[in-house]
Interface confidence: low
């Protein structure tokens, strides 16, 4: 069947539409288009004859129509008047007529809408606002958006006038939003620019900050007032009902108790004509004096003196607090507080008690701290240390020794060589030394405040020939798989190479062997019994070399699991039983025996003469190494059979 399809069906003004013919018969004479729902010569648009391929305009032809060989009709530059029905009249080859009608609708391209308002400054909870979407357009749908969202459901929102007008009843500050309207028709949709609703509101009850109402005398009072308001509120301050100033902040420096009272902030909105006030009560407390610390001993001597620190001034009904090193007082038997906490006594001061110490006075609002106090504890001198630690020097080098002893006040130093005073300096320097400079070098440290002196003596040897070294050990009896041993080659000498041998061989490569301290120290980690060998150290320089006597490492080990011999377990009655127990151990272990769990003798050998079947049972050997603290044991079963009944062995 012949049909007409309009593409598109809804056409925008100025655009074009194609009336597309479907199921056109094959053999045609011609066809003609008419405006309307029927064939009417007065409303013919165009006719077309196939044979002549001639198109003839009709009375309704506007010059905007184009006819195609397939009978489709294109109408360009569409106007509103083009809306409606179009009829195709087809004359077939057999001159039989056929008709089909199609239609389309024309809509204008919508202009960008705008929003008009009946009230640009509505007052909260009082006014209504009516937004109207302009212009009024026929066949258009009106939509509204608030903050780019569709309208919320609210009894205060009402659409009217075909949704063209949006009314907000009893506006609130929350209605301050971006409003947009949109117009739609089948061919276009346009959205307006946003309109921001400026709702006048407030002032709300003002808030005064900060919230604290208690102050100390001498502080600055700085109160700030804020009230939600549009336009911004104008502020006034009243103290005890008396007007002060018209500012948002009230500042009173260096307040006194007389500034206590009621402080009122008044907020005024000139547009809404409303006033709101908030009152806060401020209390000013008298300022207590700043505390300070007095001491009964400003220069106490370590381990001799006690010090009493007192928090001044004395104030009745006051809480005193103490801090040491910015921490509350530690629990210590050497720290004592008086009943009122005002006096802190340090018994037998040490150099670690220097502080700082602070005391505090607590009042209604806060704690006032004293300035910190530091104790000058006199101590020392401790035993001086002489550096460097070398004891052997070659002739011709410079000898430079430095002495230091912990001391307060700093120690005064003196040097003696072989008991003869040399100089009163912390450092001793002798250039180009010879063998004659060998001797006993003594550093004496003296504390003038405490009157104490301490000395350290060091033997210095000056020799071209290296001395015979010796080996010192930090552990003479290490335990296997537990201890480490550090061998040190003595003496320490300048410009000297240190070497090591084990059982006459150079050191084996082993993760358990480590050289340090310029190869002067050999450390054996996790010693084993195999480390019980002869260790020799050697020293050499450009002119001489020397080796120490060997030192054999005495490794304590064991006891290992003992062995009972002979291995036999079957015996004939009447034989002698002679069991010997042995366990690898250093030192030799202590042995003991148990037969069937009953303790016997503490010997390495167990002897029983002329055994009988009564001697059947379990024989246990127990070994114990008192040096390693370790124990071990083994159990053996012995069977004794009557003579001639068992092929056992006789002892």
């Amino acid at each position: 069947k012949l049909t007409i399809e309009s593409t598109p069906f809804n056409v925008a003004e100025g655009k074009e539409v194609l009336l597309l013919v479907h199921n056109l018969p094959q053999h045609l004479f011609g066809y003609s288009w008419y405006k309307g729902e029927r064939v009417d010569g007065n409303r013919q648009i165009i006719g077309y004859v196939i044979g002549t391929q001639q198109a003839t305009p009709g009375p309704a032809y506007s010059g905007r129509e184009i006819i195609y060989p397939n009978a489709s009709l294109l109408i360009q530059n569409i106007i509103q008047n083009d809306t409606g029905f179009y009829t195709l009249h087809v004359i077939k080859s057999d001159l039989v007529n056929e008709e089909a009608t199609g239609q389309f609708r024309v809509y204008p391209e919508l202009p960008k809408p705008s929003i008009s308002s009946n009230n640009s400054k509505p007052v909260e909870d009082k006014d209504a606002v009516a937004f109207t979407c302009e212009p009024e357009t026929q066949d258009a749908t009106y939509l509204w958006w608030v903050n780019n969202q569709s309208l919320p459901v609210s009894p205060r929102l009402q659409l009217s006038n075909g949704n063209r007008t949006l009314t907000l009843f009893n506006v609130t500050r929350n209605d301050t939003a971006s409003y947009k309207c949109e117009t739609q028709n089948p061919v276009s949709a346009r959205r307006s620019d946003s309109v921001i609703l400026n709702v006048l509101y407030g002032p709300d009850a003002p808030t005064i900050s900060p919230l604290n109402t208690s102050y100390r005398s001498g502080e600055n009072l700085n109160l700030s007032c804020h009230a939600a308001s549009n336009p911004p509120a104008q502020y006034s301050w009243f103290v005890n009902g008396t007007f002060q100033q018209s500012t948002q902040e009230l500042f009173i420096p260096n307040i006194t108790v007389n500034n206590s009272g009621s402080y009122t902030c008044q907020a005024h909105n000139s547009d809404t004509g409303l006033n709101r006030t908030t009152v806060t009560t401020i209390t000013v407390y008298a300022e207590p004096p700043k505390p300070f610390i007095t001491s009964n001993n400003s220069n106490p001597v370590e381990d001799e003196d006690a010090v009493a620190l007192t928090c001044e001034p004395e104030i009745q009904n006051t809480t005193y607090l103490w801090w040491v090193n910015n921490q509350s007082l530690p629990v210590s038997p050497r720290l004592q507080l008086s009943n009122d906490n005002r006096t802190l006594t340090l018994l037998s001061v040490t150099r670690n008690d220097v502080g700082p110490y602070e005391c505090g006075i607590q009042n209604e609002l806060s704690v006032d701290h004293s300035d910190p106090v530091i104790l000058n504890v006199l101590y020392g001198p401790d035993d001086p240390t002489i550096s460097p630690s070398y004891t052997y020097y070659r002739p011709g080098v410079n000898l430079s020794l430095s002495c230091h002893a912990a001391s307060n006040p700093p120690a005064q130093y003196s040097w003696l060589i072989d008991g003869n005073i040399q100089q009163h300096t912390q450092e001793l320097f002798i250039s180009n030394i010879t063998e004659k400079n060998s001797g006993l070098y003594t550093c004496q440290a003296n504390n003038s405040a405490s009157g104490h002196s301490r000395t350290t003596v060091k033997t210095i040897t000056v020799s071209a020939e290296l001395p015979k070294p010796s080996i010192s050990s930090n552990n003479s009896k290490p335990v296997e798989d537990k201890d480490a041993v550090a061998f040190t080659c003595e003496p320490e000498a300048q410009n000297t190479t240190y070497l090591w041998w084990v059982n006459g061989q150079s050191l084996p490569v082993s993760p358990r062997l480590q050289l340090s301290n310029g190869n002067r120290t050999l450390t054996l980690f996790n010693v084993t019994r195999n480390d019980a060998r002869a260790y020799v150290c050697g020293i050499q320089n450009s002119v001489s070399a020397n080796r120490s006597d060997p030192v054999t490492l005495d490794v304590l080990y064991g006891p290992d699991t003992p062995i009972i011999s002979p291995p036999d377990s079957s015996y004939l009655s009447g034989a002698n039983l002679n069991l010997s127990c042995h366990s690898a151990s250093n030192p030799s272990p202590q042995y003991s025996w148990r037969i069937n769990g009953i303790p016997q003798q503490h010997t390495q050998v167990l002897f029983i003469a002329k055994i009988t079947p009564n001697n059947n049972g379990t024989y246990a050997c127990f070994v114990s190494n008192l040096a390693t603290g370790r124990n071990n044991s083994i159990v053996k079963s012995i069977t004794v059979s009557a003579s001639g009944t068992s092929p056992g062995l006789s002892a």
């Epitope: 400026n198 600055n220 700085n222 700030s224 911004p232 018209s246 948002q248 902040e249 420096p253 000139s270």
Partner: antibody, heavy 121, light 106 residues
Framework: EVQLLESGGGLVQPGGSLRLSCAAS????????MGWVRRAPGKGLEWVSS????????SYADSVKGRFTISRDNSKNTLYLQMNSLRAEDTAVYYC??????????????WGQGTLVTVSS | DIQMTQSPSSLSASVGDRVTITCRAS??????LNWYQEKPGKAPKLLIY???SLQSGVPSRFSGSGSGTDFTLTISSLQPEDFATYYC????????FGQGTKLEIK
């Protein structure tokens, strides 16, 4: 005589930080609101930030919010502007200025001579 | 934020002329508007605050008017020292400035 003296400006790389100071004298600093205003080369004045007399109330332009911090030390009569994450568009002469305590209309009655901040790599 | 628009952006006039500069706010700011004068190499100077209040020490030939969204700065008789850039500033929050009007010698 009211005097405001800015310091701390200079050349800094993008992303860097700078702290401007403004030493005030000749008026009761502790009771005055203070502010910072800047002028970029070839541009107009731009308000940057303001602070209440007791540091309770601070306000910032959107262009510097989250990067700049205004503060004051009333004991030293000094206003500060800590500028972090600096950008090339922060290049400007920065003025320190005073808001007097006149009811209902904030305005800047005294200005410093300004300090130049240049943000460039 | 409130936007401030000044017009004209530049203006040529002669000594003795009467000059008017306008400033428009994007929303009502009541009478919270200030005017400043800035000369090259110098700090800005306050002329008018609260739309119409003359700052102490400023010559009376400067005057301000307006409220809501439209404001005017008038110089009744231009003097040689008046050639400068003029800025309006709204005193709501934040305290934004207009883009400036450059007053030049004709």
């Amino acid at each position: 005589e009211v005097q405001l003296l800015e310091s701390g400006g200079g050349l800094v790389q993008p992303g860097g930080s700078l702290r401007l100071s403004c030493a005030a004298s000749g008026f009761t600093f502790s009771s005055s609101y203070m502010g910072w205003v800047r002028r970029a080369p070839g541009k107009g004045l731009e308000w940057v930030s303001s602070i209440g007399s007791g540091s309770y109330s601070t306000s910032y332009a959107d262009s510097v919010k989250g990067r700049f911090t205004i503060s004051r030390d009333n004991s030293k009569n000094t206003l500060y502007l800590q500028m972090n994450s600096l950008r090339a568009e922060d290049t400007a002469v920065y003025y320190c200025a005073r808001y007097p305590s006149v009811p209902f209309s904030p305005h800047l009655d005294y200005w410093g001579q300004g300090t130049l901040v240049t943000v460039s790599s | 934020d409130i936007q401030m628009t000044q017009s004209p952006s530049s203006l040529s006039a002669s000594v003795g002329d009467r000059v008017t500069i306008t400033c428009r706010a994007s929303q009502s700011i009541s009478s919270y508007l200030n005017w400043y004068q800035e000369k090259p190499g110098k700090a800005p100077k306050l002329l008018i605050y609260a739309a119409s209040s003359l700052q102490s020490g400023v010559p009376s030939r400067f005057s301000g008017s307006g409220s809501g969204t439209d404001f005017t700065l008038t110089i009744s008789s231009l003097q040689p020292e008046d050639f400068a850039t003029y800025y309006c500033q709204q005193a709501g929050n934040p305290h934004t400035f207009g883009q400036g009007t450059k007053l030049e010698i004709k």
